[in-house]
Interface confidence: low
């Protein structure tokens, strides 16, 4: 009856970590003596190809400096402890604790037996690294320039993670890759630039990094920040503003990041009626004349800048009751 | 951080109907289920349904179908549960909750009380 | 609907223990299975999502194992803020069920 070794293709282990790299001897087989089990590197150099051996008196040794006995164990082969007890090799499942980078790379399990002579089989060995994400805004001032508004990193991640952006705004991403701190592994940041507009301030995006470690993609929503100038419109003219009419009001209705410092309220002729009272953002008009057949502008300050909007007053004779719907300057 | 905040405790007749409201902050609200999951007094916990707000698609429990109804409000980030002809073994610690990957995040339960 | 049975319904063990909890779901749900752990008063909080691995600020003390029906929640030295009502779920199939709960008391 054949026998062969049951091994993994390949097997993931995480940076510093320990890894199982399994190995068995099957079916068992009656009879079937295992003189010796050994571990090895074939692609290393030659003095670090014999990584463990496992020998059925004198039990484990481990010859090769890297990985090294401090770092290296058999889960569950057993050596003969007297007359009376076998050792147990069938499984030679090997644990190598502490991963590097270095410990990346081809094994070979390898059972010598009697009377069936040795058999192999071969384990890629991949060092894997989570990696820790991070994402935050960038408090920007809007320009007409693309500019960073938003980064996300992540940081050590081997292999490096993949950063991709979900947002409904008209963005681009750059990305830059360096070395982390641990060997081996890689920091990746993506920066999400746009032109900055107050379209997009408060807007949240949301930075996806997928990663092999992960069991999903990590998704970290980011609310953006740009500090723009006052985006001015004026509300409350309804086109039914008569003669000595009294409950008339225009709002200046504001959109600005940050909050606006001054509104001012003039009109275009020069000219400002006395019945018309500046309450902050609310023009107030105590009883509608004349002087009100003009435009009126509302002029909005912030730390960033200034902005303003215009609203063209018609004054009628008499109301109109045709029934005028409102509308915006 | 997230949060989910319910509304308060109920006392209904049988027969009659009750609507618990959950309201959802510290994350994108469209992006996850919201569960409901009950749990009777000394008793286990019962899944009811869920609602995914980003399309309003929803899923029952089939031993609650035609009693209940789950919804989501996006405007106020809000989720509902509402479970109509109640009986007496309705009466319960109503949770709403957030699937992540497992139930990562619970509302602080509402009692509904079922009793004439 | 997939049944989720648990066992023991009720556990006592003294602090430093090692506690196993077991569920058995009626059919095969692959490592869809999550453990949560129950105290008075408060929700359930999640310590265990797919099988095996352990949720964020969870202790290392807790882990779980198990695939397709057989799943174990393992407490490997119990401490007395363990003490708590400890569920299991599935969530391979629709509808999410739960197991009935283990009581885990301190002797």
């Known amino acids: 009856q054949d026998v062969r070794v049951q091994v993994l293709p390949e097997v993931r282990g995480q940076l510093g970590g320990t890894v199982e790299l399994p190995c068995h001897l099957l079916p068992p087989v009656p009879g079937l003596y295992i003189s010796l089990v050994t571990w090895q590197r074939p692609d290393a150099p030659a003095n670090h190809q014999n990584v463990a051996a496992f020998h059925p008196k004198m039990g484990p040794s481990f010859p090769s400096p890297k990985p090294g006995s401090e770092r290296l164990s058999f889960v569950s082969a057993k050596q003969s402890t007297g007359q009376d007890t076998e050792a147990e090799l069938q499984d030679a499942t090997l644990a190598l604790h502490g991963l590097t980078v270095e410990d990346e790379g081809n094994y070979t399990c390898e059972f010598a037996t009697f009377p069936k002579g040795s058999v192999r089989g071969m384990t890629w060995l991949r060092v894997i690294a989570k990696p820790k994400n991070q994402a935050e805004a960038q408090k920007v001032t809007f320009s007409q320039d693309p500019t960073t508004v938003a980064l996300c990193i992540s940081k050590e991640g081997r292999p490096p993670a993949r950063i991709s952006w979900l947002s409904s705004l008209d963005w681009e991403a750059k990305e830059t890759q360096v070395s982390g701190t641990l060997a081996g592994t890689v920091t990746v940041t993506s920066r999400f630039t746009l032109v900055p507009s107050g379209r997009a301030d408060g807007v949240t995006v949301t930075c996806k990094v997928e990663h092999e470690s992960f069991e999903e993609p990590a998704l970290i929503p980011v609310t953006l920040s740009v500090r723009y100038p006052p985006e001015v419109s004026i509300s409350g003219y309804d086109d039914n503003w008569y003669l000595g009419r009294t409950d008339a009001t225009l709002s200046c209705d504001v959109r600005s990041n940050p909050e606006p410092t001054g509104y001012d309220w003039s009109t275009t002729s020069g000219t400002f009626p006395t019945s018309a009272v500046a309450q902050g953002s609310q023009l107030v008009i105590h009883a509608v004349d004349s002087l009100f057949n003009t435009t009126f502008v509302c002029t909005v300050t912030n730390a960033v800048g200034m902005g303003r909007a215009e609203q063209v007053i018609f004054v009628r004779e008499t109301p109109n009751t045709a029934g005028a719907g409102a509308t915006g300057g | 951080q997230v949060q989910l905040v319910q509304s308060g405790a109920e006392v209904k007749k049988p027969g009659s109907s009750v609507k618990v409201s959950c309201k959802a902050s510290?994350?994108?609200?469209?992006?996850?289920?919201i569960h409901w999951v009950r749990q009777p007094p000394g008793k286990g916990l019962e899944w009811i349904g869920a609602?995914?707000?980003?399309?309003?698609?929803?899923n029952y429990n089939q031993k609650f179908q035609g009693r209940v109804t789950i919804t989501a409000d996006e405007s106020t980030s809000t989720a509902y549960m509402e479970l109509s002809s109640l009986r007496s073994e309705d009466t319960a610690v109503y949770y709403c909750?957030?699937?992540?990957?497992?139930?990562?995040?619970w509302g602080q339960g509402t009692t509904v009380t079922v009793s004439s | 609907d997939i049944q989720m049975t648990q066992s023991p319904s009720t556990l006592s063990a003294s602090v430093g223990d090692r506690v196993t909890i077991t569920c058995r779901a009626s059919?095969?749900?692959?490592?869809?299975v999550a453990w949560y752990q129950q105290k008075p008063g408060q929700p359930p909080k999640t310590l265990i999502y797919?099988?095996?691995y352990r949720y964020s600020g969870v202790p290392d003390r807790f882990s779980g194992s198990g695939s397709g029906t057989d799943f174990t929640l393992t407490i490997s030295s119990l401490q007395a803020e363990d003490v708590a009502v400890y569920y299991c779920?599935?969530?391979?199939?629709?509808?999410?069920?739960f197991g009935q709960g283990t009581k885990l008391e301190i002797k």
């Open positions: 909750t957030k699937l992540v990957g497992t139930f990562d995040y």
């Open positions: 510290g994350y994108i609200f469209t992006s996850y289920w």
């Open positions: 609602v995914y707000p980003g399309n309003s698609d929803s």
């Open positions: 059919q095969n749900v692959g490592i869809n």
């Open positions: 797919s099988a095996s």
């Open positions: 779920q599935q969530y391979n199939t629709n509808p999410f069920t």
